[in-house]
């Protein structure tokens, strides 16, 4: 990692606990004004690779609710409403950080966890594999 | 929030600090085996709404490196390679959690922060506004 100069105003930490366990303030600073992904845009419906948003809930995780995109079609939607299988709808995935309660049910102790979520879908040209 | 039963094996927390400040174990548990998004798939190049990935680095943030997608075109790429401006390439955005060092430069004290990142692009039918 990058060496950070120690600031004398920092909370104290014993070497044995650092950097394995840190203090995190949960008063979230929101750098944007976005809302629920179902409301923030209608791209999921207007896309040539439209998707449905499924609610994934887990009380042992923060955030407890994550929206997962599932592509509606294997092909892509043309202007005439036909689904074109010469093109493929695929999920765009993003690795995100969440906090997992550890030990389970503990209100003030967490572990960082990386999970892969599908955020939306895009239309791609397929790679065609023919049989020799 | 959801009421979680207190587990007797939980680390202790004083009410005045809870739930504002919690302990977080930074030994990340990875629930997937994904790699750098530039390598994990070539969708960004094969999409009808292709995008470039830009590296956003901030040593005061964890993760310090985030990849931001920027759509290459305003329109969408057709099978013949031409860009169709009757359709629009738009970024798919995702709100993610990051840890921000607070106070600045402190190695073991963070604040949760929500930021909006563009993960990839999708091709949508534009909303046409006609002049009355």
């Amino acid at each position: 990692g990058i060496a950070i100069p120690r600031n004398s105003g920092c909370p104290n930490s014993e070497d044995k606990n650092f950097p394995r366990t840190v203090m995190v303030n949960l008063n979230i600073h929101n750098r944007n004004t976005s809302t629920n992904p179902k409301r923030s845009s209608d791209y999921y419906n207007r896309s040539t690779s439209p998707w449905n948003l499924h609610r994934n809930e887990d009380p042992e995780r923060y955030p407890s609710v994550i929206w997962e995109a599932k592509c509606r079609h294997l092909g892509c939607v043309k202007a005439d409403g036909n689904v074109d299988y010469h093109m493929n709808s695929v999920p765009i995935q993003q690795e995100i950080l969440v906090l997992r309660r550890e030990p389970r049910h503990c209100p003030n102790s967490f572990r960082l966890e990386k999970i892969l979520v599908s955020v939306g879908c895009t239309c791609v040209t397929p790679i065609v594999h023919h049989v020799a | 929030g959801i009421a979680i039963p207190r587990n007797s094996g939980c680390p202790n927390s004083e009410d005045k600090n809870f739930p504002r400040t919690v302990m977080v174990n930074l030994n990340i548990h990875n629930r997937n085996t994904s790699t750098n998004p530039k390598r994990s798939s070539d969708y960004y190049n094969r999409s009808t709404s292709p995008w470039n990935l830009h590296r956003n680095e901030d040593p005061e943030r964890y993760p310090s490196v985030i990849w931001e997608a920027k759509c290459r075109h305003l329109g969408c790429v057709k099978a013949d390679g031409n860009v169709d401006y009757h359709m629009n390439s738009v970024p798919i955005q995702q709100e993610i959690l990051v840890l921000r060092r607070e106070p600045r430069h402190c190695p073991n004290s963070f604040r949760l922060e929500k930021i909006l990142v563009s993960v990839g692009c999708t091709c949508v039918t534009p909303i046409v506004h006609h002049v009355a």
């Epitope: 409403g81 999920p91 790679i127 | -």
Partner: antibody, heavy 121, light 112 residues
Framework: EVQLVESGGGLVQPGGSLRLSCAAS????????VHWVRQATGKGLEWVSV???????TYNSALKSRFTISRENAKNSLYLQMNSLRAGDTAVYYC???????????????WGQGTTVTVSS | DIVMTQSPLSLPVTPGEPASISCRSS???????????FHWYLQKPGQSPQLLIY???NRFSGVPDRFSGSGSGTDFTLKISRVEAEDVGVYYC?????????FGQGTKLEIK
């Protein structure tokens, strides 16, 4: 209980038209795709068309110019309009539900009993 | 169009014995999303087809565990560990990765 009931089959002359219906119950057409699949006597299965939950469609390109799939959500019914019929279109026509949207398997999990179309002069 | 070729076309089996049907596609059935949309159906005499296996190896609800599916890419297999009298009929493989969706020509399983 999921049920699909086809109707509208019968004897028609070459060049004629026919409209098949499929009445669905136990599920909503705006939550599942529904296919038409046909089977000539003693032959295998041939896929005809599908209308997906969002109203988009996919056709067997060999038949697209003559066949049109549609649905009426209020009646929870699916239709197949067949024009310029030929002797080769003689078959049992099945409607079958797709697992699409809910489970994303893109397989046909429930089938109707079929309706027979005979094209002959 | 994707051609699905089944073998054998006829399969006489003694009850209690295993049975195996192969299906080969003319093109890979792996979608750009990484999944394979390959399925098996059974059409019993005088009945409509019924789904047995979806996405290569998943048994549809109510399908006995003596049925199993395997394979990848272009080569797939349906196995019945111990054939029962009620298993007679025509078995079809199918793909929905590419349009038009296609079926194999069918394998007729009969009891010896």
């Amino acid at each position: 209980e999921v049920q699909l009931v086809e109707s509208g089959g019968g004897l028609v002359q070459p060049g004629g038209s026919l409209r098949l219906s499929c009445a669905a119950s136990g599920f909503s057409l705006d939550s599942y795709g529904v296919h038409w699949v046909r089977q000539a006597t003693g032959k295998g299965l041939e896929w005809v068309s599908v209308i997906w939950s969002d109203g988009t469609t996919t056709y067997n390109s060999a038949l697209k110019s003559r066949f049109t799939i549609s649905r009426e959500n209020a009646k929870n019914s699916l239709y197949l309009q067949m024009n310029s019929l030929r002797a080769g279109d003689t078959a049992v026509y099945y409607c079958a539900r797709d697992t699409h949207y809910r489970l994303y398997y893109y397989a046909m999990d429930y089938w109707g009993q079929g309706t027979t179309v005979t094209v002959s002069s | 169009d994707i051609v699905m070729t089944q073998s054998p076309l006829s399969l006489p089996v003694t009850p209690g014995e295993p049975a195996s049907i192969s299906c080969r596609s003319s093109q890979s059935l792996v979608h750009s999303n990484g999944d394979t949309y390959f399925h098996w159906y059974l059409q019993k005499p005088g009945q409509s087809p019924q789904l047995l296996i979806y996405k290569v190896s998943n048994r549809f609800s109510g399908v006995p565990d003596r049925f199993s599916g395997s394979g990848s890419g272009t080569d797939f297999t349906l196995k019945i560990s111990r054939v029962e009298a009620e298993d007679v009929g025509v078995y079809y493989c199918s793909q929905t990765t590419h349009a038009p969706f296609t079926f194999g020509q069918g394998t007729k399983l009969e009891i010896k």
